[in-house]
């Protein structure tokens, strides 16, 4: 069998809302993946599991099941949304995200995604992780790749 390639493209959109009572930020982050099937037979994309981390804390998780099948030598672009919550011990971020003196409230999030594909009863998992900028101060639609956080700026693993 040939490879199945998973490429995390980036954040497509981030929609923000606030709970002023709880000083909590809700971010619905839609991401884009390209999945390429380099085989001469179809494969099923069985599920996608994703999580988002802020400051090493998981702030959101999502799982999509029975997503699609990809034909031989074909590629599909898949969008998936992860609802995230920045609250409790991170409520100090509410100050930053709602401060109107700042016009772009970029925070760095780590996007992790695992794609499970199946073919002929065989299962394969491919994982990717990427640091991305997301504006927590307003609803934003990104050009693909626009929100990428440069490798040189990544904290020590």
């Amino acid at each position: 069998p040939r490879s199945i390639d998973v490429k995390y493209i980036g954040v497509k959109s981030a929609y923000v809302s606030y709970d002023v009572q709880k000083r909590t930020i809700y971010l619905n982050i839609t991401n884009t993946l390209n999945i390429t099937n380099n085989n001469y037979y179809s494969v099923e994309v069985e599920n996608i599991t994703a999580q988002v981390q802020f400051a090493k804390t998981v702030i959101g998780k999502a799982r999509l099941n029975n997503i699609t099948h990809i034909g031989p030598l074909d590629m599909k672009q898949i969008d998936y949304t992860v609802p995230t919550v920045i609250a409790e011990e991170m409520s100090y971020m509410y100050d930053f995200c709602t401060l109107i003196s700042i016009k772009v409230h970029n925070i760095v999030l780590m996007m992790q995604v695992t794609v499970t594909t199946t073919y002929f009863g065989h299962s394969e998992q491919i994982s990717q992780e990427r640091y991305q900028y997301v504006d927590c101060g307003r609803n934003t639609t990104y050009q693909l790749g626009q929100s990428e956080y440069l490798n040189v700026l990544q904290p020590q693993q």
Epitope: Y18, V20, Q21, R23, S91, Y92, Y94, D95, F96, C97, T98, L99, I100, S101, K103, V104, D135, G137, R138, T140
Partner: antibody, heavy 119, light 111 residues
């Protein structure tokens, strides 16, 4: 109904100090940034200070930086402006206002409290 | 600092007719995020300023749709389609692209 009520304005000598207060009601005070704006005798408006919702960040123009300190008490729903080294050009009607994080505007203003700096 | 410039007085208008108030900024208020950080406030006699327009063209809550605003990055116009007696006051434009600055205010004059 959003209400902002300023107090503490007075006649003070140049070089003196004064603390203004702003009592907020009708909204979740701890969820909003707040600002002070002043209106000079010639009716010009000048922004004086901004504080974030939890008090973590404060922002000032150069004209008051180092002389004015903005703070807040989210338990008492009260905003403060500590003014020191006052000058005659600080004479104004001082308003507090709520910062709205959706419109990026100061959307509600109090009625103001008067500060006069004169020998 | 960004300087906001307004005429001190409007052309006198008759009740029921339209009025325009202009404002100019010393620098474009259009941010790279696509938002223009221009605001209009009205101060009625004996009252504190009230928000009319935010982000150049959006009507604040409770403001009648007789009010509208448009502009480029540096030149802005507030329009009142049918002036009423309650519209009398001083109109201030303001920006917060950078730290807040206000225009000197334009007094709406009624004939």
């Amino acid at each position: 109904e959003v209400q902002l009520v300023e107090s503490g304005g007075d006649l003070v000598k140049p070089g003196g100090s004064l603390r203004l207060s702003c009592a907020a009601s009708g909204f979740t005070f701890s969820g909003y940034g707040m600002s002070w704006i002043r209106q000079t005798p010639d009716k010009r408006l000048e922004w004086v200070a901004t504080i974030s919702s939890g008090g973590r960040y404060t922002v000032y123009p150069d004209s008051v930086k180092g002389r004015f300190t903005m703070s807040r008490d989210n338990v008492k729903n009260t905003l403060y402006l500590q003014m020191s080294s006052l000058k005659s050009e600080d004479t104004a009607l001082y308003y507090c206002a709520r910062d709205n994080f959706y419109s990026y505007a100061m959307d509600y203003w109090g009625l103001g409290t008067s500060v006069t700096v004169s020998a | 600092d960004i300087v906001m410039t307004q005429a001190a007085f409007s052309n006198p208008v008759t009740l029921g007719t339209s009025a325009s108030i202009s404002c100019r900024s010393s620098k474009s208020l259009l941010h790279s995020n696509g938002i223009t950080y221009l605001f209009w406030y009205l101060q009625k006699p004996g009252q504190s300023p009230q928000l009319l327009i935010y982000q150049m063209s959006n009507l604040a809550s409770g403001v009648p749709d007789r009010f509208s605003s448009s502009g480029s990055g540096t030149d802005f116009t507030l329009r009142i389609s049918r002036v009423e007696a309650e519209d009398v006051g001083v109109y201030y434009c303001a920006q917060n692209l950078e730290l807040w600055t206000f225009g000197g205010g334009t007094k709406l004059e009624i004939k």
